[in-house]
């Protein structure tokens, strides 16, 4: 039965005489008159089993003491720590020549754990042990004991176990403690890799290469390796592991991020506090959930704050110029926490009688510099219809607007375009041609831009080349031009007039009067 004694973590004890309860019962030769097992008391009045010999009177002493069989436990090199008291021969009168101040340490490897006799020839000498000057004065209760400590090592060992033996050649000595141990590099965690207990190599300069395994919740970055040195110290760590996402290093372990913290990637970074406007409700979060009403864009890093769509633009000003509108506004009061703000323009054409009946303006309207994705806070809108109610909405948008579009993000203004000259008449036709007259008809302009007050027909003889023309005005969309010369080519132009003025003349219509009466219906082509 052995009691518990504390030794360095890199030493594994195979034998400790101080821990044995009761007699050690080692084998002495000779059986009497040589080594003797004697109890001395420690400071707690607990007996310490020692082996003593003090045969300093007789020359040629050869007293052997052999331990029980000691298992090797896979160790190739073992260490023997001997604590002993050796009496100075000068303190013993009349023993010059017979008194010695050394003893010898031997070992014998064996697979047999029950060898009963000491066969001196089987033993190999480890060393001669002498008391050096570095003894310690150990207080055994209220008594002082000079204690020497010597450590020797032996190896490589190959059999299952071994015996140690102490040979006295005439010293006055007490073996107070015999401890046999081997060295190991103790289980350790380095760079988040766990390295197992590793027995040191066979010789005092050997290095044992050991591969580590990543601790829980971590992964290899580079293959973790270390070397176990002969003294039981780990050397030259190579490679490492990194804590998985959602975990951070704490005391050589990968701990889950606490609630309210997160870690997005396998790095050596610590968990970070959830960015503004986000939270985590579980331990081990790899990202944080955005607060209600806040969002993360697809390309936003997990470390970025959650953001929200911007508020509406401010101070929208409109400036109507006939059928064009210039709009200007200010940035929103709240950008939602983002820099990627832009503006979209929505144009709606609304009925005069019922403003709620609006429909999209369509593709005929033009926007400068553009309709969507505006980075500036102004836009020009052209090619609108005159005398028309328009509602323009300016939407402030950012990277997260698509997740929560809301009318709160836009501002609108309703305008009415001014009177404007009508557009040109697209089609003029000669309905009837005689020797002295031409009957004309035409369509209303595509964009009257108001109420058409009248049409103006301009005509002239073709060979006069507009040097001398005549004007006929009519409120109707047809008219008879009389008083013409027979067999003469005439060119006709028609334009419309509103309160805003005349529109452009139509394309020319060329008609030649007849020599004899006839009825011609033209399609806008030249009539002969």
């Amino acid at each position: 039965v052995t009691g518990s004694r504390v030794y360095p973590a890199n030493e594994v004890t195979l034998l400790d005489s101080r821990s044995v309860q009761g007699e050690l019962g080692w084998i002495a030769s000779p059986l009497e008159g040589g080594w003797e097992e004697v109890s001395i008391m420690d400071e707690k009045n607990t007996p310490i089993r020692t082996y003593q010999v003090c045969n300093v009177m007789e020359a040629s002493q050869n007293n052997w003491l052999r331990t029980d069989w000691i298992t090797r436990e896979g160790a190739q090199r073992v260490y023997i720590e001997i604590k002993f008291t050796l009496r100075d021969c000068n303190s013993l009168p009349g023993v010059m020549g017979t008194c010695k101040e050394t003893f010898n340490l031997y070992y014998y490897e064996s697979d047999n754990d029950k060898e009963r006799f000491i066969r001196e020839s089987q033993f190999g000498k480890i060393d001669t042990i002498a008391a050096d000057e570095s003894f310690t004065q150990v207080d055994i209760g209220d008594r002082i004991m000079k204690l020497n400590t010597e450590i020797r090592d032996v190896g490589p060992l190959s059999k299952k176990g071994f015996y140690l033996a102490f040979q006295d050649v005439g010293a006055c000595i007490a073996l107070v403690s015999v401890r046999v141990f081997y060295k190991k590099c103790p289980l350790t965690v380095r760079n988040l890799a766990q390295f197992p207990d590793t027995i040191t190599g066979a010789d005092t300069s050997s290095l044992v290469e050991v591969r580590g395994s990543c601790v829980n919740n971590s992964e290899e970055k580079d293959v973790p390796k270390m070397y176990c040195g002969a003294d039981g110290e780990w050397l030259v760590p190579i490679g490492n592991c990194l804590c998985n996402a959602g975990h951070e290093e704490q005391n050589g372990e990968c701990q889950a991020c606490k609630i309210g913290y997160y870690k997005a990637l396998s790095t050596d970074a610590s968990c970070a506090k959830c960015p503004p406007h986000s939270y985590s409700v579980w331990e081990g979060a790899t990202s944080c959930t955005c607060d209600r009403g806040f969002f993360r864009a697809d390309n936003d890093a997990a470390s970025m704050p959650c953001t929200r769509p911007p508020s509406a633009p401010l101070n929208l000003i409109s400036n109507v110029n006939e059928t064009s509108v210039n709009l200007e506004w200010s940035s929103p009061q709240n950008t939602g926490g983002r820099q990627d703000i832009s503006y979209n323009v929505v144009c709606k054409k609304c009925g005069a009688g019922d403003p709620s009946k609006c429909r999209p303006c369509g593709s005929g309207v033009h926007y400068t510099p553009q309709q969507n994705g505006l980075k500036t806070t102004r836009v020009s809108i052209t090619d609108l219809l005159a005398h028309t109610n328009y509602t323009f909405e300016i939407w402030a948008v950012n990277g997260v607007s698509k997740y929560n579009p809301s009318p709160d993000q836009s501002v609108s203004v309703t305008v009415t375009t001014n009177q404007a000259a009508p557009s040109s008449i697209a089609l003029v036709q000669a309905k009837e041609v005689t020797r002295y007259s031409v009957a004309l008809a035409w369509l209303e302009p595509d964009r009257p831009n108001g109420v058409i007050l009248e049409y103006e027909v301009k005509y002239y003889e073709k060979d006069q080349n507009e040097r001398s023309y005549r004007i006929v005005r009519t409120a109707a969309r047809n008219t008879d031009i009389k008083g013409l010369n027979p067999l003469t080519s005439y060119v006709f132009h028609v334009r419309a007039r509103t309160a805003a003025g005349y529109g452009d003349f139509s394309e020319p219509l060329e008609v030649t009067t007849n020599t004899v009466p006839s009825r011609i219906i033209g399609d806008g082509a030249n009539s002969t």
């Epitope: 008159g33 009177m57 008291t85 009349g94 000079k146």
Partner: antibody, heavy 121, light 106 residues
Framework: QVQLLQSGAEVKKPGASVKVPCKAS????????MSWVRQAPGQGLEWMGW????????TYAQGFTGRFVFSLDTSVSTAYLQISSLKAEDTAVYYC??????????????WGQGTLVTVSS | EIVLTQSPATLSVSPGERATLSCRAS??????PAWYQQKPGQAPRLLIY???TRATGIPDRFSASGSGTDFTLTISRVEPEDFAVYYC????????FGQGTKVEIK
């Protein structure tokens, strides 16, 4: 068993000599030193010295040099104390005692019964 | 040489009581004294030597302690056969005895 046997009382005149034997038995005589102790009547113990029974090398305490001689006859496992030129103040019980040497302290673990030497004219 | 002084010269105790005997060295010593018991008309008997090691046959009511210059022999419960004279003895290249303490019945 281990024992030390001393001779009986001796009465001597001043100036005479006496040789006190101490015969050992029950152990290897040459393995242990033999010590001699004097105790004057009504007094305490005085250590006189010892002799290495293996080499015959004697050690004398202060005050016991010159007239006092330790000797051996290993063939009969006997130690001797010889006192010459006896004086009245040599009257005492003389004990032989086997020496017990250890690392942590010495003692005399086996004693003879003592020999009373009386010096009287 | 080292002089050992024992005190008290005489100690009166009743059977069953504890007895404490002192032995003081004239200078600090690195070892512990041996203790002997001597009854009238008998040779001394070794009680304790070394690091308070009891000699063969000595009961465990006898114990020794001390270091440096002051040493003590303690009889935890005095028995009738313990009444005697007790000597301390210092070893080294030269041995000396104390003058003795007589333990008598109270």
């Amino acid at each position: 068993q281990v024992q030390l046997l001393q001779s009986g009382a001796e009465v001597k005149k001043p100036g005479a000599s006496v040789k006190v034997p101490c015969k050992a038995s029950g152990y290897t005589f040459t393995s242990r030193a033999m010590s001699w102790v004097r105790q004057a009547p009504g007094q305490g113990l005085e250590w006189m010295g010892w002799i290495n029974t293996n080499t015959g090398n004697p050690t004398y305490a202060q005050g016991f040099t010159g007239r006092f001689v330790f000797s051996l006859d290993t063939s009969v496992s006997t130690a001797y104390l010889q006192i010459s030129s006896l004086k009245a103040e040599d009257t005492a019980v003389y004990y032989c005692a086997r020496v017990r040497l250890t690392v942590y302290g010495d003692g005399m673990d086996v004693w003879g019964q003592g020999t009373l030497v009386t010096v009287s004219s | 040489e080292i002089v050992l002084t024992q005190s008290p010269a005489t100690l009166s105790v009743s059977p069953g009581e504890r007895a404490t005997l002192s032995c003081r060295a004239s200078q600090s010593v690195s070892s512990n004294p041996a203790w002997y018991q001597q009854k009238p008309g008998q040779a001394p008997r070794l009680l304790i030597y070394g690091l308070s090691t009891r000699a063969t046959g000595i009961p465990d009511r006898f114990s020794a302690s001390g270091s440096g210059t002051d040493f003590t022999l303690t009889i935890s419960r005095v028995e009738p056969e313990d009444f005697a004279v007790y000597y301390c003895q210092q070893y080294g290249p030269s041995w000396t005895f104390g003058q003795g303490t007589k333990v008598e019945i109270k």
